[in-house]
């Protein structure tokens, strides 16, 4: 039963939620966000659709996550790009796409990359083309943190739910 | 000692693992599990081998992980694909590799994709050719859900403990 | 307040952590390491720069993390790889990148590969080139295991803080 | 539709250094690289080399290599030019930024080198 | 380096003629896996940047009057206009983008008489 083996107030807390296991007693701070479809030369993180949510005080504000409390947090993302039947016109240089998750903090007055992985793709030899990317580590954040990303190449993802994402949560 | 500042039943639950420390006193499911690299044309999830296992209430049943408890699970997988050397039977044509982790609950009558990655690979171009791909984040789950995988590509899997897996943790 | 619901030790334990909240009121074993940008044709794991850290009995030794206590980790990796502005030497010949976490413990007298990702590039051809590689699962790992890696392609290293690094948290 | 916009014409002396600007207005360029071409009155079109603003690679042709010096500013859309040791007739020339993904040109900056 | 060399390096035609031009490479630009030709053909009008008008040898860019045609392969390639404009008074060039460093033609100069 919920609440079996804790102390009152965890009990009171798995009451709340009649869901929970013992295994899941302490809710922990967790989001998962999907790049938003309906925007083709952007790319604008929704919590509120499909596969997507906010949990525990994770707040979502200027396409960044905000951090709810001091820890250490799993931070990871994905981004697939595809480049449709010759889409280059005259030039054989590669097509440069990076995705790169950064941290913005009130102990540093510039954006720092967490997480960064980056390709070349060569339109012009190899079309229609696809290529996905992904990246995800523990850091050590502090509450108001601010997890946003970056991404050269934004007008070749691939929007949808299971390939464009980008998620934390607390250890 | 384990089990030291812990309620009675949970205590309880500690001396029962005896390697348990307090860190570790909630017991997670989770799962991971390997592709049979006996079966050449099919991918087979495998959790009784290497290090492969499934814990506290994971199962594998269909080639499906059945999700034990409601809750947040972060979901992961992985896939190497790989060519042989150059066959003078190979074209310019590409090929398509991908692979998909998706959902089958109750909540919905046909398989959800959670997480998908692609590539093609131009094996006229390149030969040997070898591409790995990673995915991984968190969803929210519901007891009974299934987990299960989607490749494109199967014939050019590269079988090992350590290339080709699938796995989720409860949060 | 830190301590409010939890049982006298632990209650103590979170009274040391002052910013510690009731999720996050159990401290796990967690590391997160980072490639040392000064050594170009090694890839030495740094622990006190940067992002990285090492927390709650984890500790670096000979380039290896050491798993604190037994239980099952999240165990995960990144390498960025890449080949500079075009060379008239370069040939067709394709180039092998892998990386991999190694796992060396007392139950095995050799280096039993966790986690495997494998490309080839073929310089000659495309110029300027880039690569990402990550991987990333769950492992049921023993106090004293040592984790490392092993890569091909060393010279080729992309040697930032958020593009190589090597890390692991206990679940 | 996306464009590229030049600095506008500079009047330099022998022996000085210019930086042209490229900016790129309608499209985010970091992905795309950009080149950069010389054309003498009279004269047809030189490849002087390329940039990937996005990676920071380049690519020079070898005539231009120690003349030319690119450069890129992700967060401005803007690419740059900086060509050093400016003589009188070599350098006098109309210098154009190109995107050859899509097709586009830039409208082409006049260096006069003249004491 | 790839040379490229233009053909003829000027003409005058009517309005309403047909026109051809010629260019040729000193290797072949025909990628033989897509086969694909890097070959782009520009044309700059006095006091105008170059436009782009053909790529991939024979591919139209858009807006492009379809009195513009490129064929050829390797290393022959033609520029034909099949009924002259006044407006079409230019230089053309071909440009090869197979390799390191990109090197353009001449130019052929197109006068109306």
């Known amino acids: 039963l919920p609440g079996v083996g804790l102390t009152p107030s965890a009990a009171q807390t798995a009451r709340q939620h009649p869901k929970m296991h013992l295994a899941h007693s302490t809710l922990k701070p967790a989001a998962h966000l999907i790049g938003d479809p309906s925007k083709q030369n952007s790319l604008l993180w929704r919590a509120n659709t499909d596969r997507a949510f906010l949990q525990d005080g994770f707040s979502l504000s200027n396409n960044s996550l905000l951090v709810p409390t001091s820890g250490i947090y799993f931070v990871y993302s994905q981004v697939v790009f595809s480049g449709k039947a010759y889409s280059p016109k005259a030039t054989s240089s590669p097509l440069y796409l990076a995705h790169e998750v950064q941290l913005f903090s009130s102990q540093y007055p510039f954006h720092v990359p967490l997480l960064s992985s980056q390709k070349m793709v060569y339109p012009g030899l190899q079309e229609p083309w696809l290529h996905s990317m992904y990246h995800g580590a523990a850091f050590q954040l502090t509450q108001g943190d601010q997890l946003s990303t970056h991404t050269d190449g934004i007008p070749h993802l691939v929007l949808s739910p299971s390939t464009v994402f980008f998620g934390a949560f607390a250890l | 000692l384990p089990g030291v500042g812990l309620t009675p039943s949970a205590a309880q639950t500690a001396r029962q693992h005896p390697k348990m420390h307090l860190a570790h006193s909630t017991l997670k499911p989770a799962a991971h599990l390997i592709g049979d690299p006996s079966k050449q044309n099919s991918l087979l999830w495998r959790a009784n081998t290497d290090r492969a296992f499934l814990q506290d209430g994971f199962s594998l049943s269909n080639n499906s992980l059945l999700v034990p408890t409601s809750g947040i699970y972060f979901v992961y997988s992985q896939v190497v694909f790989s060519g042989k050397a150059y066959s003078p039977k190979a074209t310019s044509s590409p090929l398509y590799l991908a692979h998909e982790v998706q959902l089958f609950s109750s909540q919905y009558p046909f398989h959800v994709p959670l997480l998908s990655s692609q590539k093609m690979v131009y094996p006229g171009l390149q030969e040997p050719w070898l591409h790995s791909m990673y995915h991984g984040a968190a969803f929210q789950l519901t007891q009974g859900d299934q987990l299960s995988t989607h490749t494109d590509g199967i014939p050019h899997l590269v079988l090992s403990p350590s290339t080709v897996f699938f796995g989720a943790f409860a949060l | 307040l830190p301590g409010v619901g939890l049982t006298p030790s632990a209650a103590q334990t979170a009274r040391q952590h002052p910013k510690m909240h009731l999720a996050h009121s159990t401290l796990k074993p967690a590391a997160h390491l980072i490639g040392d940008p000064s050594k170009q044709n090694s890839l030495l794991w740094r622990a006190n720069t940067d992002r990285a850290f090492l927390q709650d009995g984890f500790s670096l030794s000979n380039n290896s993390l050491l798993v604190p206590t037994s239980g099952i980790y999240f165990v995960y990796s990144q390498v960025v790889f890449s080949g500079k502005a075009y060379s008239p030497k370069a040939t067709s010949s394709p180039l092998y990148l892998a990386h991999e976490v190694q796992l060396f413990s007392s139950q095995y007298p050799f280096h039993v590969p966790l986690l495997s990702s494998q490309k080839m590039v073929y310089p000659g051809l495309q110029e300027p080139w880039l690569h990402s590689m990550y991987h990333g699962a769950a492992f049921q790992l023993t106090q004293g295991d040592q984790l490392s890696t092993h890569t091909d392609g060393i010279p080729h290293l992309v040697l930032s803080p958020s593009t190589v690094f090597f890390g692991a948290f206990a679940l | 539709q996306g464009q590229l916009q030049q600095s506008g014409a500079e009047l330099m002396k022998p022996g000085a250094s210019v930086k042209i600007s490229c900016k790129a207005t309608g499209y985010t360029f970091s992905s795309y690289w950009i080149e950069w071409v010389k054309q003498r009155p009279g004269h047809g079109l030189e490849w002087i080399g390329e940039i990937s603003p996005g990676s920071g690679s380049t690519n020079y042709n070898e005539e231009f290599k120690g003349k030319a010096t690119f450069t890129a500013d992700k967060s401005s859309n803007t690419a740059y030019i900086q060509l050093s040791s400016l003589s009188t007739s070599e350098d006098s020339a109309v210098y154009y930024c190109a995107d050859g993904y899509h097709g586009y040109w830039g409208q082409g900056t006049t260096l006069t080198v003249s004491s | 380096d790839i040379v490229m060399s233009q053909s003829p390096s000027s003409l005058a035609v009517s309005v309403g003629e047909k026109v051809t031009m010629s260019c040729k490479s000193s290797?072949?630009?025909?990628?033989?896996?897509?086969?694909?030709?890097?070959l782009a053909w520009y044309q700059q009008k006095p006091g105008q940047s170059p436009k782009l008008l053909i790529y991939?040898?024979?591919t139209r860019d858009s807006g492009v009057p379809d009195r513009f045609t490129g064929s050829g392969s390797g290393t022959d390639f033609t520029l034909t206009i099949s009924s002259v404009k006044a407006e079409d008074l230019a230089v053309y060039y071909c440009?090869?983008?197979?390799?390191?460093?990109?090197?353009f033609g001449g130019g052929t100069k197109l006068e109306i008489k």
């Open positions: 290797q072949s630009l025909l990628y033989s896996t897509n086969q694909k030709n890097f």
């Open positions: 991939w040898a024979s």
């Open positions: 440009q090869q983008y197979y390799s390191y460093p990109r090197t």
